[in-house]
């Protein structure tokens, strides 16, 4: 019993003056609380609590369920307790079957004993199954059995409290342990799409998926640099014991340009937080932007291949694409494909394959593309480099020798005189007149050059060479003439092509 110091309030005294009392089932429980300021008796066992305002607690016929802690409290809030065991061979355990344990914490299997003198108070697995090897516990006859440091692996573990009575093992009702997982990582968050591109008035809907070990994970959609609460809807699932999934869907039914921005899905648990963002761009109308991959001015050698390639952005999706040359649409030799397989892709590539180009196939090649909102086009000017071709080489009535050559780039015509029968013409002759004939038209086809010299300057037998050349190659034509007396014979032209 507590010692009393004069002038200082003291706890009440209880009779019988023991900390524990054992009575048989059916016997009387009589407890007396002595204190000038007596307030009440309180009885506690498991989740049950009873009160009594009499200073003497009497239970005429004790039952196993009367086992528990009896506490007397005075007006100063001071108290004293006695624990009563009501021994009932037919009911060795008082049981509260709810059993929850937080991972890494201790949890109590609530199966207090009605008889403290039984032996081997412990836990056993159901149906004779062994308990997990690492499961440690501490028995307490008044409270139950404390499982130390609950593991996630113990979830749904079936167990009994067990004692030995007269050499036999007696089991309590079964308990199923439900483990509440501890957060050992931040939530896993993902978003349905990293970016959205919409036209005004279209619906914006984005889903954030939050995965964690339990449903106590917190999540929300936030707009960056804004405190406005966003409207979101939730769906959730438990995929197995420690695999929880929540889907938080954010919707703006009619998006406006000023809704453009970054939206963040934020989630946190006791371990930490995670977030993922999605970008919304709202445009007032669709668009197409074309980027040439090669120079829009193309020089290609005669007989060679070239690709005209564009990359373009189109939103909404492109509906019509075509390549045009001289008002004719190509039906083949071109392809159009998305730049990426991503569903939010807005970039595309179009290629026109021009094969074995001829000198006559230079000109403007146009790529046209349209969607439901806009049209766009880009033109390529294709120049075909061709070796000069000598179109005409004549002696005119005025005695001029004239050479007309066509090619691209513009050919240069040089004149040479070869005296007698020499094959090599080295002495150059200055032309009297040089003209580019079709410079007024678009310079895609061959350029035609005309050059003339005065044949009266030649006083000896020989050959005149007209040589036309450009970056691609050269071609020559020859005029043979002979003198008979003072008269020039007929001039015989012929050509020699030099690759």
């Amino acid at each position: 019993q507590p010692s009393v110091s004069p002038g200082e309030p003291s706890p009440p005294s209880i009779h019988p003056g023991k900390s524990d009392l054992i009575v048989r089932v059916g016997d009387e429980i009589r407890l007396l609380c002595t204190d000038p300021g007596f307030v009440k008796w309180t009885f506690e066992i498991l989740d049950e609590t009873n009160e009594n305002k009499q200073n003497e607690w009497i239970t005429e016929k004790a039952e196993a369920t009367n086992t528990g802690k009896y506490t007397c409290t005075n007006k100063h809030g001071l108290s004293n307790s006695i624990y009563v065991f009501v021994r009932d061979p037919a009911k060795l355990f008082l049981v509260d079957r709810s059993l929850y344990g937080k991972e890494d914490n201790d949890t109590l299997v609530r199966c207090p004993l009605t008889d403290p003198e039984v032996t081997n108070y412990s836990l056993k697995g159901c149906q004779g199954k062994p308990l997990p090897k690492d499961l440690r516990f501490i028995p307490d006859p008044k409270a139950g059995i404390m499982i130390k440091s609950v593991k996630r692996a113990y979830h749904r573990l079936c167990l009994h409290c067990s004692v030995d009575q007269e050499g036999k093992s007696v089991l309590s009702e079964k308990f199923i342990l439900k483990v509440r997982p501890a957060f050992k990582a931040v939530p896993v968050v993902s978003v349905s799409k990293a970016s959205y591109l919409l036209r005004e008035g279209e619906e914006f809907t984005v889903t954030c998926t939050i995965k964690d070990v339990s449903s106590s994970v917190y999540s929300t959609w936030k707009r960056e640099n804004s405190q406005t609460k966003l409207q979101e809807k939730y769906n959730s699932w438990h995929h197995g014991d420690f695999n929880y999934e929540r889907q938080a869907t954010l919707t703006i039914s009619s998006a406006r340009v000023n809704d453009s921005g970054v939206f963040m899905c934020y989630a946190n648990n006791t371990f930490g937080s995670a977030n993922v963002t999605t970008t919304l761009e709202v445009v007032d109308k669709g668009f197409i932007n074309i980027f040439p991959m090669i120079n829009t001015t193309v020089f290609v050698n005669d007989g060679e291949n070239v690709d005209l390639i564009v990359e373009y952005e189109a939103f909404p999706k492109p509906e019509h694409q075509q390549w045009i040359y001289m008002n004719r649409t190509f039906t083949d030799k071109w392809e159009d494909y998305p730049k990426s397989e991503n569903e939010s892709n807005i970039r595309y590539v179009s290629e026109l394959h021009l094969t074995r180009l001829k000198g006559t196939e230079g000109g403007t090649y146009t790529f046209l593309v349209s969607n439901s909102d806009v049209n766009a086009a880009i033109a390529f000017n294709v120049y075909v480099n061709t070796k000069p071709e000598i179109l005409t080489y004549d002696r005119l009535v005025n005695g001029m020798l004239q050479c007309v050559a066509a090619g691209f780039p513009e050919p240069t015509i040089d004149w040479y005189f070869c005296p007698g029968t020499e094959q090599r013409c080295s002495a150059s002759v200055l032309p009297v007149d040089v003209q580019t004939l079709n410079s007024s038209g678009p310079p895609f086809g061959k350029l035609v050059v005309q050059s003339s010299i005065d044949s009266s300057a030649f006083k000896h037998n020989g050959t005149v060479e007209c040589k036309a050349y450009n970056d691609v190659g050269k071609t020559s034509a020859y005029f043979n003439f002979a003198f008979k007396g003072n008269n020039k014979e007929q001039i015989h032209p012929h050509t020699l092509f030099t690759p």
């Epitope: 980027f291 040439p292 991959m293 090669i294 120079n295 193309v298 020089f299 290609v300 050698n301 060679e304 291949n305 070239v306 690709d307 390639i309 990359e311 392809e335 494909y337 998305p338 990426s340 397989e341 590539v349 394959h353 094969t355």
Partner: antibody, heavy 117, light 108 residues
């Protein structure tokens, strides 16, 4: 006449760098896509990288991504391959090629790169 | 990425023989397949582009064809200068360029 001439190959230590050049003549590289392809001794062909010299778009094989850089100078009509953090497995003859209609129609003579300590 | 499996890896043939080399794409591809010839110490030379188009200057005994994901190079009558290694090459939108492993054509 179309011609491609590679240069810049040689012996280099692992971890070292090398810059290959591909001088083009007979055509304008800004009208085409230029590629580098390599061939390890006794092995097959492996595509390395490509560039559209006019627009600057570049593409790389996974095996060289982050280590090699393809570039071009249209005024010099030349393509380049800057190779950093070279490894023994980068030892090969490196070819420069012109690309048209999903094929490589003109190739250079190749330049040998040897990575060895 | 799309793989191109070339077969056979080598073959022996005589002058005048008809020779067929096959490349199989691991998945459906466009007709963007080319064939090259390479001789020792030399750069590859383009023979066929777009699966069946003969490149200019290439003899007409070379031809290309396609059947589903199988692409075939045929030499109708093998000539002495045709002994070399042949490569197929495929272009795909998202994987760019891949080559077959090569087929060495040797003299029997």
């Amino acid at each position: 006449e179309v011609q491609l001439v590679e240069s810049g190959g040689g012996l280099v230590q692992p971890g070292g760098s090398l810059r290959l050049s591909c001088a083009a003549s007979g055509f304008n590289i800004s009208s085409y896509s230029m590629h580098w392809v390599r061939q390890a001794p006794g092995k097959g062909l492996e595509w390395v990288a490509s560039i559209y010299p006019y627009s600057g778009y570049t593409y790389y094989a996974d095996s060289v991504k982050g280590r090699f850089t393809i570039s071009a100078d249209t005024s010099k009509n030349t393509a380049y391959l800057q190779m950093n953090s070279l490894r023994a497995e980068d030892t090969a003859v490196y070819y420069c090629a012109r690309y048209v209609y999903h094929a490589l129609d003109y190739w250079g003579q190749g330049t040998l790169v040897t990575v060895s300590s | 990425d799309i793989q191109m499996t070339q077969s056979p890896s080598s073959l022996s043939a005589s002058v005048g023989d008809r020779v067929t080399i096959t490349c199989r794409a691991s998945q459906s591809v466009s007709s963007a397949v080319a064939w090259y010839q390479q001789k020792p110490g030399k750069a590859p030379k383009l023979l066929i582009y777009s699966a069946s188009s003969l490149y200019s200057g290439v003899p007409s005994r070379f031809s290309g064809s396609r059947s589903g994901t199988d692409f075939t190079l045929t030499i109708s009558s093998l000539q002495p200068e045709d002994f070399a290694t042949y490569y197929c090459q495929q272009w795909a939108v998202h994987s760019l360029i891949t080559f077959g492993q090569g087929t060495k054509v040797e003299i029997k």
